[in-house]
Amino acid sequence: SAHAHPRDSCPLGPGRCCHLETVQATLEDLGWSDWVLSPRQLQLSMCVGECPHLYRSANTHAQIKARLHGLQPDKVPAPCCVPSSYTPVVLMHRTDSGVSLQTYDDLVARGCHCA
Amino acid sequence: SAHAHPRDSCPLGPGRCCHLETVQATLEDLGWSDWVLSPRQLQLSMCVGECPHLYRSANTHAQIKARLHGLQPDKVPAPCCVPSSYTPVVLMHRTDSGVSLQTYDDLVARGCHCA
């Protein structure tokens, strides 16, 4: 079938392949201090690491990309590590009349894959 | 709001930023010649190019990633160019008894963004 099995063990060694990592960021880092009140610091999960051949392939396209990258590395880039899902986050932000709570669905990564 | 405006003009010069590019691939290239009969060659649209700050940001997470990459380039990778949507593709493949047409929804990229 079109779907070769994406592999889950990292051939590059521990922590080198595509995975979720927590990055601490302040409102100042994000440029949000003028409109967000809370939280003052965000634990941002982000996708980092390399995508060796067929590691955590997002889909058939990613598998093809991995294969063609092996054949034509100058023309076809390797798949890269991006979020596969997100954790919703609530921000408390200023409004014209006061404060409001708003949920953001695409702010913090929950899982990663190679696309 | 959390969404800064993703920009669409490439600051790196024509063809350098994240875009869709066609790559010709044979069934042999893909390792599919034993089970796919048609097409013998696929025009594969793939996402290639760089993702400079806020260029075609997929979502808020990608905008945060771009900003934090500017602050901590060793810790946070730049966003990378991945498919935002796909064009369905029909493959004619061998079955035990003959041939069958099957649609694959995630094989050829139709659009790209920076995630």
């Epitope: - | 009969l37 593709v89 649609t103 050829v108």
Partner: antibody, heavy 118, light 107 residues
Framework: QVTLKESGPGILQPSQTLSLTCSFS??????????VGWIRQPSGKGLEWLAH???????YFNTALKSRLTISKDTSNNQVFLKIASVDTADSATYYC??????????WGQGTSVTVSS | DIVMTQSHKFMSTSVGDRVSITCKAS??????VAWYQQKPGQSPKFLIY???YRYTGVPDRFTGSGSGTDFTFTISSVQAEDLAVYYC?????????FGGGTKLEIK
């Protein structure tokens, strides 16, 4: 479930233009590798391929009829159109449309009967 | 254009018999020949692709063979419901062309 249905004028006069519509469901003409073809069959005779149009808008025509044929598609409304200019009695036939996956015509409509008569 | 010739317009057979229908191409078409079945009052049904590949759901009593210019479609054990006209069609190059058809009659 794939279905195709042809519609046409039924009867028309010589020298007029025949306009046929193929309305389909169960597949999309924006899918790579998919096309829709037209085939006709005069009463009691064999099949004659007329034209087909692909997902990427590439078009192919029967050599003998090419100058009289126009094929087009409306992808969003799942329709394909065939026009035959300057018809005469020899164009009387049942007209079929068929879904194509590469060079397979795997699903056919029920056909629409066209009579050219003065 | 490639001309496809089915030399027999009619073939008569009995239920349970094996029957073969032939088709000849005017030039080499490799294995690019399809076969269709058209029952009375119905639209054609796709059976065989690229000379020998049965399409999904087609009973295994239907087989095809051949390459180059000579092709054969075989029903290993004819059933009453196989009464139909059978057409070959080349898909080697456009314009696609059909044979004239062979009508299978059940004795």
């Amino acid at each position: 479930q794939v279905t195709l249905k042809e519609s046409g004028p039924g009867i028309l006069q010589p020298s007029q233009t025949l306009s046929l519509t193929c309305s389909f469901s169960g597949f999309s003409l924006s899918t790579y590798g998919i096309g829709v073809g037209w085939i006709r069959q005069p009463s009691g005779k064999g099949l004659e391929w007329l034209a087909h149009i692909w997902w990427n808008n590439n078009k192919y025509f029967n050599t003998a009829l090419k100058s009289r044929l126009t094929i087009s598609k409306d992808t969003s409304n799942n329709q394909v159109f065939l026009k035959i200019a300057s018809v005469d009695t020899a164009d009387s036939a049942t007209y079929y449309c068929a879904r194509m996956g590469y060079d397979i015509m795997d699903y056919w409509g029920q056909g629409t009967s066209v009579t050219v008569s003065s | 254009d490639i001309v496809m010739t089915q030399s027999h317009k009619f073939m008569s057979t009995s239920v349970g018999d094996r029957v073969s229908i032939t088709c000849k191409a005017s030039q080499d078409v490799n294995t690019a020949v399809a076969w269709y079945q058209q029952k009375p009052g119905q639209s054609p049904k796709f059976l065989i692709y690229s000379s020998s590949y049965r399409y999904t759901g087609v009973p295994d009593r239907f087989t095809g063979s051949g390459s180059g210019t000579d092709f054969t479609f075989t029903i290993s054990s004819v059933q009453a419901e196989d009464l139909a006209v059978y057409y070959c069609q080349q898909h080697y190059s456009t314009p696609w062309t059909f044979g004239g058809g062979t009508k299978l009659e059940i004795k």
